[in-house]
Interface confidence: medium
């Protein structure tokens, strides 16, 4: 049995268990998947579609399917369906939408639900270069090699919330091996991590995650990390950059950083001391009031959040602490010659609402090339369409991203740092112990 | 006249490969997912494989996995299969069919059958 | 193990109803599946019989008599196919299919005989 553990990956392999509803006659059904989208070869899973009570039926289709995946009469009280997947094997792996039937007729598609399966390779390993015990400031390398050559490779740090670096050669070239330099090391990027490998033409199919790898740094300062409880819409801290490669120049973004967090540890302890006063106030002003007044301090004003269901049953898989605390780093490594320039497309999940700061790369040739034809990786972000570059370019770094041991296969990138911006949408209803308050784009790579 | 012709049947040797041709008519044949079919003489029927109207999925029958390639040329409303590695198993009618596409898919267009045997 | 199991034959008089089954197993649940039946007789083209997923939700193949209807039995994991008023002309080999797990599979075929 594989351990568990978490992390998210940057495509947004669900986009979260829960997905917006649409206003009109038949809204879009909800689609997710429990115990995860992320599911070992062998294990169950369960996918659900919650539609509305007027539900007749729900549909089950997966995508370049010809014929419905599965249908199922809804259980009470009809607004979902339960779709069991007693053992997750290839078959299983790829991109599902459900419908429902009322008796107007069939609903909208919901959202994509893209389900993956690991352990459909055997398992990379993954290696520290020079040596797992690395000093602060120092630069190391962690190695994911497969036995077999593969053309993508997936770093995933326990406990965090993306994949560090996910390296895709393209043009058919497949590689044994994949480097994910970081460098200048920090206490940040102690930890354990794991590497995935995958073929392109099989986007929903993992490797077995490697051996863990524990990842020390000494002579550090005391670590950084923000609290777990953090909020997820205040300042990222140093976490939320990206692995620093060998020899770049990061414009002094660390100790920049430094000053962020201390400037918001200032401000969060000058916050909480006034909440702690006013609330004092509040207390000893109540003392003098009377019952009747005091109840009416109770009452939910109008437009006030309801408060949320207790059914935690369908929450989502994601703790509110892994959420928040990944080196947010994802690149899609095209295969080029040393002298071809490069280009670099930022992009954004059109429903990208975390405000965290993730750095998504994508990295083209300059040079005319004929690309090939391929459904877009749920494991390289290329499905994130918008071309909107935030104004944050003071905190674009040079990286480096070497897909293979062969000195042409090295990609220079550009990666632009944006933030990505809460969406002026309303919030969606509450539903069954989701936190409109935090809606994540990513999936929670659970292995189970 | 909606009509499906197989054709390329005919005796190989085990390890050997043979290539069949499906002509579609009557209808639009790149809106369809297209099948193959086949059925041992006095057996059930089996499904070898099908390819989507985009020429981006093919799906295959575990026991033809890796040996039977379907391709189709929407241009000239062709469909085949490439047998390689033919086992004396393969030895069947092989019949080319076409999902209705509806949400009830089913098989609605048959061709006639091509027979395949395979022998030493 | 096949997914379907069909009986090899049933014999029925001319006039009769005849009851085909098609049992599905590895666990997968005949709720939540269309089955498809195919009739082929003897010497032709298989055709589609009847596409059935509810009593709602049917439909029967071209030029198949309005006399053939679908059900099914979620208690013993079953599809039925029932041919009533049998005919001399329905004397055929009806095979039950689903699709399941990127694959279309087919049962065995029951060989239906009109005595």
């Known amino acids: 049995m594989i351990p568990t553990f978490t992390a998210l990956l940057c495509l947004g392999l669900s986009l979260g268990p829960r997905t917006h509803m649409q206003a009109g006659p038949l809204p879009k059904p909800t689609l997710w998947a429990e115990p995860g989208s992320v599911i070992s070869w062998g294990n169950s899973v369960t996918i659900w579609c919650q539609g509305t009570l007027e539900a007749r039926e729900y549909r089950l289709d997966k995508e370049e399917s010809p014929a419905p995946w599965d249908r199922q009469n809804p259980l009470e009280p009809k607004n979902k369906a339960r779709f069991s997947i007693p053992s997750m094997t290839e078959d299983y792996a790829g991109r599902y939408r459900c419908y429902y039937r009322s008796p107007v007729g069939w609903s909208q598609p919901s959202d994509p639900l893209e389900l993956v399966m690991t352990g459909a390779y055997s398992k990379p390993t993954l290696s520290a270069l020079p040596s797992p015990l690395v000093t602060s400031g120092k630069s190391v390398t962690l190695l994911c090699q497969s036995r077999s050559p593969m053309d993508t490779f997936l770093l995933i740090k326990e406990r965090a919330a993306h994949p560090l670096l996910h390296l895709r050669s393209e043009h058919g070239a497949q590689q044994h091996q994949a480097e994910f330099p970081m460098s200048p090391v920090t206490s940040v990027h102690g930890g354990t991590y794991r590497c995935f490998s995958s073929h392109g033409f099989s986007h929903y199919l993992l490797s077995h995650p490697s051996d863990p790898l524990e990842l020390i740094v000494s002579g550090s300062l005391e670590d950084p990390r923000p609290s777990p409880t953090r909020s997820v819409s205040t300042a990222a801290g140093p976490e939320d950059q990206p692995l620093m490669p060998t020899g770049s120049v990061p414009h002094s973004g660390l100790r920049r950083h430094w000053e962020v967090l201390i400037g918001v540890l200032v401000v969060s302890i000058l916050l909480l001391s006034l909440l702690l006063f006013l609330l004092l106030q509040h207390w000893r002003q109540g003392k003098h009031r009377t019952l009747a007044q005091r109840q009416a301090d109770f009452q939910r004003p109008p437009g006030a959040a309801e408060p949320e269901p207790k059914d935690g049953g369908l929450q989502r898989r994601s703790s509110p602490a892994a959420d928040v605390q990944g080196e947010n780093f994802c690149a899609a490594v095209k295969n080029t010659q040393p002298e071809d320039g490069v280009e670099m497309d930022t992009r954004q999940s059109p429903h990208d609402e975390d405000p965290q700061a993730v750095t998504y790369a994508k990295v083209k040739h300059s040079r005319p090339r004929r690309e090939m034809a391929s459904p877009p990786s749920p494991l390289s972000g290329e499905f994130l369409d918008t071309k909107d570059r935030q104004a944050e370019e003071d905190r674009q770094m040079d990286t480096e991203a070497a897909a293979s041991e062969a000195p042409q296969d090295v990609t220079y990138a550009q990666l632009h740092s944006f933030t990505l911006r809460q969406k002026a949408t309303e919030p969606p209803p509450s539903q069954e112990g989701a936190s409109p308050a935090e809606p994540s784009v990513y999936a929670t790579l659970a292995i189970h | 006249e909606v009509k499906l012709v197989e054709s390329g049947g005919g005796l190989v040797k085990p390890g050997g490969s043979l290539k069949l041709s499906c002509a579609a008519s009557?209808?639009?044949?790149?809106?369809?997912?297209m099948n193959w079919v086949r059925q041992a003489p006095g057996k059930r029927l089996e499904w070898v494989g099908d390819?989507?109207?985009?020429?981006?999925?093919?799906n295959y029958s575990p026991s033809v996995k890796g040996r039977f390639t379907i391709s189709r040329d929407n241009a000239k409303s062709i469909l085949y299969l490439q047998m390689n590695s033919v086992k004396s198993e393969d030895t069947a009618t092989y019949y080319c069919?076409?999902?209705?596409?509806?949400?009830?898919?089913?098989?609605?267009?048959w061709g006639q059958g091509i027979q395949v045997t395979v022998s030493s | 193990q096949s997914i379907l199991t069909q009986p090899p034959s049933i014999s029925e008089s001319l006039g009769s109803t005849a009851r085909l089954t098609c049992t599905l197993n590895n666990g997968i649940s005949v709720g939540g599946k269309n089955i498809y039946w195919y009739q082929q007789m003897a010497g032709s083209v298989p055709r589609l019989f009847l596409y059935?997923?509810?009593?709602?939700?049917?439909?029967?193949g071209p030029g198949v008599p309005n006399r053939d209807s679908g059900s099914k039995d979620t208690s013993k994991k079953a599809a039925n196919l029932q041919i009533s008023e049998l005919q001399v002309e329905d004397e055929a080999v009806c095979f039950c299919?689903?699709?399941?797990?990127?694959?279309?599979?087919f049962g065995s075929g029951t060989k239906v005989t009109v005595l």
């Open positions: 059935y997923y509810s009593d709602s939700d049917k439909e029967l």
């Open positions: 069919v076409r999902n209705h596409g509806s949400r009830y898919a089913y098989f609605d267009v």
């Open positions: 299919s689903i699709y399941e797990s990127n694959t279309w599979v």
């Open positions: 009557g209808f639009m044949f790149s809106s369809y997912w």
């Open positions: 390819i989507n109207k985009d020429v981006t999925t093919t």
